[in-house]
């Protein structure tokens, strides 16, 4: 069964910033990837990134930097500086399209006891919804 | 079709609070982030911040940290933002904004007119 | 925070006139957003994405530009078209606006 993990770390160099990393275990060919914060994307949440293997990424506020990191896991930086960043307890999803397994998504905070610059590695977060 | 509903106009005395909502209809409150903004004669319209009915997360713009306070009740399909300490600078309309499907100010309330005076 | 700066602040057009303004941007943003807003309303989505219409929006309104410089145009001026345009960015927290472009009926 493929499974969506989701990791969020704070920076130790910039507290208010956060980086999300999301990966898809499985073994079909990703064709969308979308990241979004407060909650699942079109179901609570608000979209941080969109990013499309042939497309192109794009992104919103508060959204610095989105990449793939490998064909099957992607990493966004949060912009920080304090300015209207993003509490530790914020959730952020994210949700794989892939063919021919259909969408999965995931979701993941902060650990509440922390610290900035560690974090736990990266595990499978609860699958939310699997369209 | 989607409607956001806010409270009644509001003239209040300097110093203290005030909280207007945002009641929605026509869609699942949870699905979707809700904005409020300001507009003032003095700075034009004014993002305040977002809020996640469906989780409760929050994003303040840092010039209405201390000043706004965003909040949801899912039972009643409500958003509320309460305004601390009120100066004269604080009188404006109020509006409420349901994002679309990405990131747009796609639905906006009818606007809560808060007048501050003595 | 990433300011936008409206120009003109007022203007007017007679009917059937192509109008143009124009909404500058202090660092290079990704997209810009316009609402309209009649007096006594609410501002009103028109484009977003800089240049895809809301639903419902006239076809004689269309946005153009990127990095710093964006513009939208109405290509033939009509009574219900007077009202106040504002431009918006999605960039960069906090979420800013300009401060506004009057459009009147001359």
């Known amino acids: 069964t493929p499974e969506v993990w989701v990791q969020v770390r704070m920076e130790a160099t910039e507290l208010s910033s956060f980086t999300i990393r999301c990966g898809f275990l499985g073994s079909g060919s990703i064709s969308l990837v979308t990241v979004s914060w407060g909650g699942p994307n079109g179901a609570g949440g608000t979209t941080l990134a969109v990013l499309h293997p042939e497309r192109g990424i794009r992104q919103w506020a508060p959204a610095r930097q989105a990449r793939w990191e490998t064909q099957s896991s992607i990493s966004l930086i949060l912009e920080g500086s304090g300015a209207s960043s993003p509490c530790a307890n914020t959730t952020f999803c994210c949700k794989f399209a892939s063919f021919p397994e259909g969408s999965w998504e995931a979701c993941g905070s902060l650990p509440p006891s922390s610290d900035p610059g560690l974090s736990a590695p990266p595990t499978p977060a609860p699958i939310l919804r699997a369209d | 079709q989607v409607q956001l509903q806010q409270s009644g106009p509001e003239l209040v005395r300097p110093g203290v609070s005030v909280k207007i909502s945002c009641k929605v209809s026509?869609?699942?409150?949870?699905?979707?982030?809700m904005h409020w903004v300001k507009q003032s004669h003095a700075k034009s319209l004014e993002w305040i911040g977002i809020?996640?009915?469906?989780?409760?997360?929050?994003n303040y713009n840092q010039n209405f940290k201390g000043k706004a306070t965003m909040t949801v009740d899912k039972s009643s399909s409500t958003a509320y933002m309460a305004l601390a300490r009120l100066t004269s600078e604080d009188s404006a309309i109020y509006y409420c904004a349901r994002e679309g499907d990405l990131p747009m100010f796609a639905y906006w309330g009818q606007g809560t007119l808060v007048t501050v005076s003595a | 925070q990433i300011v936008l700066t409206q120009s003109p602040t007022i203007m007017s057009a007679s009917p059937g006139e192509k109008v143009t303004m124009t909404c500058s941007a202090s660092s290079s943003v990704s997209y810009i957003y316009w609402y309209q807003q009649n007096p006594g309303s609410s501002p009103r989505l028109l484009i977003y994405d800089t240049s895809i219409l809301a639903s419902g929006v006239p076809f004689r309104f269309s946005g153009s530009g990127s990095g710093t410089s964006y513009s939208l145009t109405i290509s033939r001026m009509e009574a219900e078209d007077a009202a106040t345009y504002y431009c918006q960015q999605w960039t960069s927290y906090p979420l800013t606006f300009g401060s506004g472009t009057k459009l009147e009926l001359k």
């Open positions: 026509g869609y699942t409150f949870t699905d979707y982030v």
């Open positions: 809020i996640s009915p469906y989780s409760g997360n929050t």
